[in-house]
């Protein structure tokens, strides 16, 4: 498999058949598949070097792994997008052997002077062809030469099979399955041959190809493949339940932010709630996690403005639940990214020198910002797309807080909508779905560069649009939701999470 280890070294060679028998639309489809693969790999913070070859009668090398930009995913994608099926029109035979020789030439080195770490570099060849080679001879001989070069299968004690993977995608109207199977790697419990119809569900294909065991602690990563559970798609999501004898129970959501902490809303708890009465579950697991302590933001005080006629005041409505035992990360349990951390810098593929302010400008620019939250409907977690009103609609969004029960007498809306809040909901630019009571404490998320970054904590809403936990279809335009802006509570997060190795900026 493609071992995505951020500290490892990898070369990926993309080889695309542009011969007559492929056809323009299949060529374009294959290109799109490779673009998606580059993006998927880049989303792991891994920077492999890419080689890019198209071929028909002759190969054309577009990107060499030795080029300075070959590890720049955006640049490689640009080169790939600029390739035309017409590029091989005049010499449109199929010489797969020559194409693989071009890959060999990129991999190779003069006698005795291999590049440093040659024996620690993994090589992945992704060949997209119909297998109908009609000139140059059998391409399998070049695969043997590559294995020889990389010292694979020579030493019984150390066969090094992990260091070469050859994936073959059958593209085109007619595919010679025998030829394709012959070229692909054969490894136990791994799939190295894919068909055209597989390419309709690329996430499923990538799931077969990628070994992410070295990067389970990466924040904001998800799997969207069809066999995945709700928690493959939202692995940070935590369900919180507070049992109060004689008073029933309160349901909230939260987000895993580290191996020991879940971030949620402070209003989910009262000062009287004992740790043993708080149930937290993650990853869709039935068992509850043991709680060590709940840490409230020191400035949170729901009764803080009662004297001023404000019955409930949600400023600084954030809390961290510290778990007794360390979470074991896996594909259904992993952290979400937090603002102003090194993990988020890497997730957004920003330079290491990026400041907190620059992250803020990237994630919360002064405009309508596409975001999402996760809600549970009929026992299923679903993503709801909303827009954070952070530009010219911000004022009107915040003013609608006056329609909230108990806030109608508030003279100045900034009394309840402090600078700590982000506002969503309403009908412009689109009709946003609203949060329900049980969504409180869950993350408000920005999805960028295939990663998920939490920017807010769901706090309160103007209208309860979820009678009996069913969302009403028709909701008034003033149905707004308010979320604690994490950029505004960073000093507290930084202090409480200082031992969690998140690398706050």
């Amino acid at each position: 498999k493609i071992v995505l280890d951020p500290s490892g070294s990898m070369n990926i060679y993309l080889v695309l058949d542009g011969s007559d028998s492929i056809g323009a639309s299949n060529f374009t489809g294959a290109k799109k598949c490779l673009v998606n693969l580059i993006e998927k790999v880049a989303s792991y913070g891994v920077k492999p070097r890419y080689g890019l070859v198209t071929y028909a009668t002759y190969p054309k090398i577009w990107v060499k792994v030795s080029e300075a930009d070959s590890s720049n995913a955006d640049w490689v994608t640009k080169q790939l997008n600029e390739i035309n099926y017409e590029d091989h029109k005049l010499k449109s035979g199929t010489n797969t052997k020559k194409a693989l020789q071009a890959v060999y030439s990129m991999m190779s080195w003069p006698d005795d002077v291999p590049p440093e770490g040659w024996n620690r570099t993994r090589h992945v060849i992704i060949l997209m062809t119909d297998g109908l080679h009609n000139m140059g001879g059998d391409p399998i001989t070049v695969i043997d030469e590559i294995r020889d070069l990389l010292y694979i299968g020579k030493d019984r004690k150390n066969p090094r099979e992990d260091y070469l993977d050859v994936y073959v995608f059958g593209v085109g109207p007619l595919v010679n399955q025998v030829n394709i199977n012959a070229l692909a790697s054969k490894k136990d419990n791994e799939q190295h041959v894919f068909k055209v119809k597989d390419m309709e569900n690329l996430e499923d294909v990538f799931y077969q190809m990628i070994d992410e065991s070295q990067s389970l602690s990466l924040c904001g990563m998800v799997w969207e493949h069809r066999k995945g559970t709700d928690y493959h798609k939202q692995p940070w999501q935590a369900k919180i339940s507070v049992i109060r004898p004689s008073k029933g129970h309160e349901s909230c959501m939260g987000a895993v932010v580290s191996e020991y902490f879940v971030l949620t809303a402070a209003h989910c708890f009262t000062v009287d709630d004992k740790e043993h009465s708080i149930k937290v579950s993650v990853g869709g697991e039935k068992r509850d996690l043991e709680i060590e302590v709940v840490l409230f933001h020191p400035n949170y005080n729901i009764n803080g403005k009662k004297e001023a006629g404000i019955p409930e005041f949600y400023d600084y409505d954030v809390a961290l639940i510290k778990l007794k035992n360390k979470l074991k990360y896996g594909q259904t349990i992993r952290p979400i990214c937090l603002p102003c951390t090194e993990g988020t810098t890497r997730a957004l593929r920003l330079p290491p020198t990026t400041t907190c302010q620059q992250q803020k400008e990237e994630l919360l620019p002064a405009q309508d910002i596409k975001a999402l939250f996760v809600s549970e409907e009929e026992k299923k977690l679903t993503r709801k797309e909303v827009y954070i009103k952070n530009g010219d609609k911000k004022g009107s969004c915040e003013r609608d807080a006056q329609y909230a029960p108990g806030y109608d007498k508030v003279k100045d809306i900034s009394e309840v909508v402090t600078p700590r809040f982000l506002c969503t909901g309403g009908v412009s630019p689109y009709a946003d779905p609203n949060t329900c009571r049980g969504d409180s404490g869950g993350p408000l998320i920005v999805h960028k560069r295939s990663r998920f970054i939490q920017v807010g904590v769901i706090s309160w809403g103007v209208v309860d649009v979820c009678k009996n936990q069913k969302r009403q279809k028709q909701v008034p335009a003033h149905a707004r939701d308010f979320h604690i802006n994490l950029f505004q509570v960073l000093p507290w997060l930084k202090e409480k999470l200082q031992d969690e190795d998140l690398g706050f900026l």
Partner: antibody, heavy 118, light 112 residues
Framework: EVQLQQSGPELVKPGASVKMSCKAS????????MNWVKQSHGKSLEWIGR????????FYNQRFKGKATLTVDKSSSTAHMELRSLTSEDSALYYC???????????WGQGTLVTVSA | DIVMTQAAFSNPVTLGTSASISCSSS???????????LYWYLQRPGQSPQLLIY???NLASGVPDRFSGSGSGTDFTLRISRVEAEDVGVYYC?????????FGGGTKLEIK
Amino acid sequence: EVQLQQSGPELVKPGASVKMSCKASGYSFTDYLMNWVKQSHGKSLEWIGRINPYNGDAFYNQRFKGKATLTVDKSSSTAHMELRSLTSEDSALYYCARLENDYGFTYWGQGTLVTVSA
Amino acid sequence: DIVMTQAAFSNPVTLGTSASISCSSSKSLLHSNGITYLYWYLQRPGQSPQLLIYRMSNLASGVPDRFSGSGSGTDFTLRISRVEAEDVGVYYCAQMLERPWTFGGGTKLEIK
């Protein structure tokens, strides 16, 4: 600190043989190819050959085949070069140099001066 | 064998000014992998050679960034941006594309 310590100067008679050494320290001896380079007085550098200390496999510049023999002693992390049938043409400064992948000869010994004279 | 050619002496340079040393090869040193296997060494008087530049344009560890290497497949240049007294010596180019590895005759840097 990586060091290549070469044996002292040699004064030898024509037709005789000489064996010089290069003791490596500060790194894993078997991990890098050891090379030998000749520098005749006031002249350029000439690559003689290299040896792989891991398995003793040697490769020679055709010009020095039959003239030079490269060997290693892994137990003492020492490379040796023997030159035979010496003539005045072999009078030169001989360097050992460590080859580090494709970075080139990153470390050199201080050289062994061989003088062939009757 | 690949022949490396250098002029025996550089044009005399003044300390603090820049100097260029040239080298050419009888065959292109550009490998099919895209890397050019050309190296520069400096031998100061009475010392062993020292690696300056590897793979045509990469600065070796510990070498001041006053030194830089450039070139095409067969013609190469070593540039010293501000010559200092310690830069005096003989500069050798070498190729590692094909065995036997070969060195140029060396260029002596002359100070005015």
